[in-house]
Amino acid sequence: TPLGPKWPEPVFGRLASPGFPGEYANDQERRWTLTAPPGYRLRLYFTHFDLELSHLCEYDFVKLSSGAKVLATLCGQESTDTERAPGKDTFYSLGSSLDITFRSDYSNEKPFTGFEAFYAAEDIDECQVAPGEAPTCDHHCHNHLGGFYCSCRAGYVLHRNKRTCSALCSGQVFTQRSGELSSPEYPRPYPKLSSCTYSISLEEGFSVILDFVESFDVETHPETLCPYDFLKIQTDREEHGPFCGKTLPHRIETKSNTVTITFVTDESGDHTGWKIHYTSTAQPCPYPMAPPNGHVSPVQAKYILKDSFSIFCETGYELLQGHLPLKSFTAVCQKDGSWDRPMPACSIVDCGPPDDLPSGRVEYITGPGVTTYKAVIQYSCEETFYTMKVNDGKYVCEADGFWTSSKGEKSLPVCEPVCGLSARTTGGRIYGGQKAKPGDFPWQVLILGGTTAAGALLYDNWVLTAAHAVYEQKHDASALDIRMGTLKRLSPHYTQAWSEAVFIHEGYTHDAGFDNDIALIKLNNKVVINSNITPICLPRKEAESFMRTDDIGTASGWGLTQRGFLARNLMYVDIPIVDHQKCTAAYEKPPYPRGSVTANMLCAGLESGGKDSCRGDSGGALVFLDSETERWFVGGIVSWGSMNCGEAGQYGVYTKVINYIPWIENIISDF
């Protein structure tokens, strides 16, 4: 019997009856065996077929068989009710081999030309199955030339049989106090050849309760207990199950905090599985009774292990554990049925003793030393020298534990120094001056830093002075030694202040005239205001009415006296304001350059001379009494004058402070 080509030779070719295309002879038998590679099949079709027709193709025929199965027995030219001719049909081997047998009997009634067929190997698509047949793969089937392979959805793994998908259903641990677990794919059929282990692991003290819910369907057997698929429940005390069949198992009260559920399936069956709802219970804790002025949240019928409650106090009350204040309180029920923390108290909020007010005092209004919720206190500033800034000083102890003003401020009120107070109540009768008495010029500041100069205290941490007096120290503010509160230049009993920063007017040019001869010194600490240390007021808008020609101003300082030495005691001089044109004219002649006196300056002194400020007085204040407020204000800053102090026809020249109020206010507010 002639053999067809065998793999690995190319598997395709042509078969024909003997003598084709001529007629075939009688008594012929020819057999072809075709073999394709594994995973392939053979396809065969006829391009010519002309065989003697006989009942059931008993005389001449072509038989196609694959393995033990006959695929077709063919004869004639066209199919009849009982005989089959191939026509345009294509025939496929069932496996990788195909046997073709041709046979002719002893006679032919007329000549027949036989057959011609073509064959080829082609890949089998194992993934395609006939309706009703079991699928090749459990989940996904992947065909390829010569074969196929199966794969599984996420959460499954391919069984070693290479077709079944076993569920990856082990290692799940449930730690919540209640929950649900079910067989994989529930309520759809559970997977085959799977072994699932679920753990419920609660904190010690809890007891797990299992309830089977909805439906239960696990493959069973009428005689043997769960031989195929089964569910088992194991605790540290006992084992429950195995369970199978269609009846919901009863509730299981495990009396254990750990449960292991095992579910095992075999390779067959189509069942929906099971669903368990689990809960837990524990020994209850005593019912919490809220403290006075407090309440419990949440309110529950009972509290068991891990349950918690919080205590919230009424407005104006705060949580206290012993004597310690708590931001919040939450107690947790423990396994032994006791709470982990004792009940706190709701104690009335105590704002505590109010902070001391710098330069002020505090008075208890509600009652002596009463500092609890809704208590009222009254701050006030030290009379005479301080006044309270934008605040009535009334503070209430609020629920947040802070003393709060009527405007809702939690910060202390501010006691601002009162400015312009002096022991000298009126202007009246340095160079040609008189000795100052205590409290006359409490704003007077002595500035030492290379030379002796002066300044005037503003507020309680600023000094107003002349730019030329502190120019050399503008980059080394700490070199300035600032003294106040003394009349004697050489007394050790002064109040020491130190400079934090020096601000020189940006329009001042050193050694090029004295326009904009103004500077501010910021002190590194506030000074205490008293009768010897009091700030000078800045001029009000209306101040010019007290600074007209011939109005009297007072200059003070430790500058040169008629004797040619710095004064040991603070001296002062009362001098009238000089008409601006008159002063300008006095300094138009040499050695003074034209334009020495600017609109930013004012002049003061006697035409006859003899009363003047002098070297060492620079930076000091020329002050005026505001008769409306009865406060002294700074109208000028000692700036420059003639080489010979107190010279007739020459005047002291002072920086006109009112021109610089915006500059002063900007610097003080910014720094």
Partner: antibody, heavy 121, light 106 residues
Framework: QVQLVQSGAEVKKPGASVKVSCKAS????????MHWLRQAPGQGLEWIGD????????HYIEKFKDRATLTIDKSSSTAYMELSSLRSEDTAVYYC??????????????WGQGTLVTVSS | DIQLTQSPSSLSASVGDRVTITCSAS?????MYWYQQKPGKAPKLLIY???NLASGVPSRFSGSGSGTDNTLTISSLQPEDFATYYC?????????FGQGTKVEIK
């Protein structure tokens, strides 16, 4: 040269008073503040107070406000310190010292030799 | 009142040693002053305004510091330097002294 010469040692009974003198020479007496300090046996230094010889302005620390009196005699350039109601714990060497006038004015550049005052019954 | 605490209270050193005495203030002080006192004698000014050497004081003495911590240093101890040293402040009224540091011969 600048010198401060103090009076000699004194022995006093409790309750009595003592007046220690300090004569200055070699400088303008009224230009410098005069300070008084004391040192108990084996102890540190303690400031009592000071006086301005130009006008007799005085300052005392709280502890000595009621018992110490500082005075000046300009004509003899002498400073005095009187301590009343003496107690045994007032036993000490008492110093006069000149205050500096060059920088801060708050230290002592010249000291007297000291006067030992013993208070004992 | 500002308290001044000197350390050590006493020390033993040899001629040629470098000696450092510290003075710690209970509050910040601007300037510190140092005095030397020998037995039976009045104190003598060594350092003023923290770091300035008083007239006639040898340059082996130096002062430094700021705020609450100040130091007197003797770079090379000489026989005549064995004495008690005091720090003094008057940044805050009243003026106060340290308790003293006694420098003895080892």
């Amino acid at each position: 040269q600048v010198q401060l010469v103090q009076s000699g040692a004194e022995v006093k009974k409790p309750g009595a008073s003592v007046k220690v003198s300090c004569k200055a020479s070699g400088y303008t007496f009224t230009n410098y503040w005069m300070h008084w300090l004391r040192q108990a046996p084996g102890q540190g230094l303690e400031w009592i107070g000071d006086i301005d010889p130009s006008d007799s302005e005085t300052h005392y620390i709280e502890k000595f406000k009621d018992r110490a009196t500082l005075t000046i005699d300009k004509s003899s350039s002498t400073a005095y310190m009187e301590l009343s109601s003496l107690r045994s714990e007032d036993t000490a060497v008492y110093y006069c010292a000149r205050g500096d006038i060059t920088t801060t004015l708050r230290y002592f550049d010249v000291w007297g030799q000291g006067t030992l005052v013993t208070v004992s019954s | 009142d500002i308290q001044l605490t000197q350390s050590p209270s006493s020390l033993s050193a040899s001629v040629g040693d470098r000696v450092t005495i510290t003075c710690s203030a209970s509050s910040s002080v601007r300037y510190m002053y140092w005095y030397q006192q020998k037995p039976g004698k009045a104190p003598k000014l060594l350092i003023y305004d923290t770091s300035n050497l008083a007239s006639g004081v040898p340059s082996r003495f130096s002062g430094s510091g700021s705020g609450t911590d100040n130091t007197l240093t003797i770079s090379s101890l000489q026989p005549e330097d064995f004495a008690t040293y005091y720090c003094q402040q008057w940044s805050s009224y009243p003026l106060t002294f340290g308790q003293g540091t006694k420098v003895e011969i080892k």
